[in-house]
Amino acid sequence: SGTTNTVAAYNLTWKSTNFKTILEWEPKPVNQVYTVQISTKSGDWKSKCFYTTDTECDLTDEIVKDVKQTYLARVFSYPAGNVESTGSAGEPLYENSPEFTPYLETNLGQPTIQSFEQVGTKVNVTVEDERTLVRRNNTFLSLRDVFGKDLIYTLYYWKSSSSGKKTAKTNTNEFLIDVDKGENYCFSVQAVIPSRTVNRKSTDSPVECMGQEKGEFRE
């Protein structure tokens, strides 16, 4: 068994949803390990995920310190076993990630309809305000806390008996819509950040229909 060369990581990719942020890369290591470093443009390079054989590193704890900052990561390849380092003068190989700005780029997670309540010909639909891993004063902030009015929700609703969809929008987590009395409706919501150029929309929430458990009905 001859020596092999240490190889640099490649395909460095940020995977981020509601600020839970993981850096992934290739290849699966053979006789080498990885250490990840993360930095803001003006900050120090902080080592994380030391000497790992994984090809991912959870960097959530670092990026939630300031989600509006732009981060850069790099993955070092260290020889571990019957290998030769291919870095110059004993310097380990490394590869840089693309830049990542959590506030602008984290994917919006699939929202959930928390409840709906019908009063006469009005229905109030409430979207669950999902907790993120962003902290302020030792408490976890919700998606709404972080994004404020930058975040809107789109409601899609339709009569159970037909396929024609209507839409409504809100910059809170609640909708108040008009419905026909005596008709059952189905609902789905989508999170949207209109000001974004990428990752503007979440996937649609699971569909909830009147006549099922989540609803309350009052004449």
């Epitope: 290591p29 390990v33 250490t35 900050g43 120090d44 390079w45 902080k46 080592s47 030391f50 000497y51 790992t52 054989t53 310190k65 070092f76 260290y78 020889p79 571990a80 076993g81 019957n82 290998v83 004993g90 380990p92």
Partner: antibody, heavy 117, light 106 residues
Framework: EVQLVQSGAEVKKPGESLKISCKGS????????MNWVKQMPGKGLEWMGM????????RLNQKFKDKATLSVDKSISTAYLQWSSLKASDTAMYYC??????????WGQGTTVTVSS | EIVLTQSPDFQSVTPKEKVTITCSAS?????MNWYQQKPDQSPKIWIY???NLASGVPSRFSGSGSGTDFTLTINSLEAEDAATYYC?????????FGGGTKVEIK
């Protein structure tokens, strides 16, 4: 030239508090994790934990969780190891060591702590 | 935590003899270092990443192993090699050291 200079030997009584120091120079102090290693007389090495000076994040060996505290003062490029109530079993040589890859290897000269009534 | 067991604890060896020190881990390790420590001195990195010699370490030293079994070998012992050698794993927290092997010149 990278240097880690530790504070001098200490003799203490059980129950007393103590803070020993490790001053880094010749490099960007906030950029490197700092390890602390314990070596009891005539015994082997024991990794206590490490601290990242830029934000004071610590990784502590659970064995030392309620016994010792790691801290830093970035303004004077100094890392600290402290005890609020010393025991005889804390008698040891304590080393600080910069977390480095490969041949880069920087250790302080060690601080001897003796705890005796 | 990963427990590292070194053997032997002590070895008294004549110059030019081959020395083998083993380090056995309680679970699989992917990154192992070896340190040399002489009396009244701080430890020095000797071998890193299982088999890479630190700067200035003579080529008579070598490191090998994988999984749970690792070895430091001195091919032809010299007087200056008298010291205690420690293995250390950095694969999972808490990082741990072996108990050490003292090499003495006969």
């Amino acid at each position: 030239e990278v240097q880690l200079v530790q504070s001098g030997a200490e003799v203490k009584k059980p129950g007393e508090s103590l803070k020993i120091s490790c001053k880094g120079s010749g490099y960007s102090f906030t950029s490197y994790w700092m390890n602390w290693v314990k070596q009891m007389p005539g015994k082997g090495l024991e990794w206590m934990g490490m601290i990242y000076p830029a934000d004071s994040e610590t990784r502590l060996n659970q064995k030392f969780k309620d016994k010792a505290t790691l801290s830093v003062d970035k303004s004077i490029s100094t890392a600290y190891l402290q005890w609020s109530s010393l025991k005889a079993s804390d008698t040891a040589m304590y080393y600080c060591a910069r977390e480095d890859y490969g041949s880069s290897d920087y250790w302080g000269q060690g601080t001897t702590v003796t705890v005796s009534s | 935590e990963i427990v590292l067991t070194q053997s032997p604890d002590f070895q008294s060896v004549t110059p030019k003899e081959k020395v083998t020190i083993t380090c056995s881990a309680s679970s699989s390790v992917s990154y192992m270092n070896w340190y040399q420590q002489k009396p009244d001195q701080s430890p020095k990195i000797w071998i890193y990443g299982i088999s890479n010699l630190a700067s200035g370490v003579p080529s008579r030293f070598s490191g090998s192993g994988s999984g749970t079994d690792f070895t430091l070998t001195i091919n032809s012992l010299e007087a200056e090699d008298a010291a205690t050698y420690y293995c250390q794993q950095k694969s999972s927290f808490p990082w741990t050291f072996g108990g050490g092997t003292k090499v003495e010149i006969k």
